[in-house]
Amino acid sequence: SSPCPQAWGPPGVQYGQPGRSVKLCCPGVTAGDPVSWFRDGEPKLLQGPDSGLGHELVLAQADSTDEGTYICQTLDGALGGTVTLQLGYPPARPVVSCQAADYENFSCTWSPSQISGLPTRYLTSYRKKTVLGADSQRRSPSTGPWPCPQDPLGAARCVVHGAEFWSQYRINVTEVNPLGASTRLLDVSLQSILRPDPPQGLRVESVPGYPRRLRASWTYPASWPCQPHFLLKFRLQYRPAQHPAWSTVEPAGLEEVITDAVAGLPHAVRVSARDFLDAGTWSTWSPEAWGTPSTGTIPKEIPAWGQLHTQPEVEPQVDSPAPPRPSLQPHPRLLDHRDSVEQVAVLA
């Protein structure tokens, strides 16, 4: 059997740290057997069998020029093996962050805090943190640890499915390379890391006959579980084309009527979502959708829910009193209560 312990990594490769003494081990001999060492491709002897170092080659203060392949051979010239030296650094604690797009699952991602230059893998696990009685020192088996299954294809991510929203979890991400291992522990609660995906299916439509209105509608993100006890609230932003500032509203449902749009101009609209009890943070913004308020008069047909106006909207006199708002019981969200007077913008 080989006197060389096989470090994790490809076979035939041994590892060391720059600036440190490195010992290479001849794999095909018995421990202590005297061997000769050569640099592959160079005929001069590096270390002879009379060195007193047996089957090992010692490189003092290794540097990048020492990286490469070495040949060791026995006293009678038989090949003892070839060894490739790769230099790098032991692992440092990885940087870990976790996020949840819904209240049942969360994922953690990691990256090295220092580049080791060596083959590296990550061990990922988690356990549920529980507050045990003072007399109990044992960890309940129901608390783990369990593996956190990693994404295939080497993506630096693992996913915990079926998490409990009100529980705390301890994530363990251990960076392993041939020179050692280093662990980062991260305590997470679903409540604090919850960040929904942005709402989907955002549509912006004009409201016929209302040159200052736009109706926006959207749906829950597909990743949000369809259960009634965890709702989302929304934030909507809109702005006319080429206007730098966004206006922000917080709709109560899955649609919103904007009543202060600039007539004749296309408007960008985007929405964001958050847990309705303010757990976690707001989602990123949805992709922008665009819409332009309608022009012209209200259609002659009266909608089933009642007649809003019989005349087209005109720009009121500045000093005229605001007309009363129509009563809209069947569709309370169709019109908005923020502006008492709709104004048609006159563009210079």
Partner: antibody, heavy 117, light 107 residues
């Protein structure tokens, strides 16, 4: 005991090629390097190249790089040296030698290659 | 290529005498120098490796010394079978090269 038995003498015309064989016995063939050397009549020794024991990796003397090809057949524990584009100055005794990476510890009996028109 | 120069080209001595053969390298080669003996009609035989390391089966009267560029093969007391051609070989860099040989003949 270690034995290296080379193929018999050859007479070749200029421009031709010659392939000399060296059958090894008495040791594990894939554990040792095989070197090829030559000695012109009344002259010293010239190293042609060597071939690795397990991976067939070669090192050549640049002087022979374009004309010499070293190969092995592990199944028969036989090493080969082919020399192409022969000229009269290639007339020599060609040796295979088992060794370590850079030394020659056991030698074949030699193969005389005569290049003559 | 590293050039090895052997001297003398021919050395005439009698059995029982001490023989000193020299090999000089065109550049420093540390101790990467080896000695071979070749008798007429035979293949060479390794005598000394790495300047001074003895080889199993080689009589103790053969010894080597030197480092850098200057090397010596010494035969402490010549036996009749020692009369042959001696070659030095370097293994410091490719290609491996030999000296032109020293012929040790009976006086």
């Amino acid at each position: 005991q270690v034995q290296l038995v080379q193929s018999g003498a050859e007479v070749k015309k200029p421009g031709a090629s010659v392939k000399v064989s060296c059958k090894a016995s008495g040791y594990t063939f894939t554990n040792y390097w095989m070197h090829w050397l030559r000695q012109r009549p009344g002259q010293g020794l010239e190293w042609i190249g060597n071939i690795g024991p397990s991976d067939s990796k070669t090192h050549y003397n640049q002087k022979f790089k374009d004309r010499a090809t070293l190969t092995v057949d592990k199944s028969t524990s036989t090493a080969y040296m082919e020399l192409s584009s022969l000229r009269s100055e290639d007339t020599a005794v060609y040796y295979c030698a088992r060794g370590d990476y850079v030394l020659f510890t056991y030698w074949g009996q030699g193969t005389l290659v005569t290049v003559s028109s | 290529d590293i050039v090895l120069t052997q001297s003398p080209a021919t050395l005439s001595l009698s059995p029982g005498e001490r023989a000193t053969l020299s090999c000089r390298a065109s550049q420093s080669i540390s101790n990467n120098l080896h000695w071979y003996q070749q008798k007429p009609g035979q293949a060479p035989r390794l005598l000394i490796k790495y300047a001074s390391q003895s080889i199993s089966g080689i009589p103790a009267r053969f010894s080597g010394s030197g480092s850098g560029t200057d090397f010596t093969l010494t035969i402490s007391s010549l036996e009749p079978e020692d009369f042959a051609v001696y070659y030095c070989q370097q293994s410091y860099s490719w290609p491996l090269t030999f000296g032109q040989g020293t012929k040790l003949e009976i006086k």
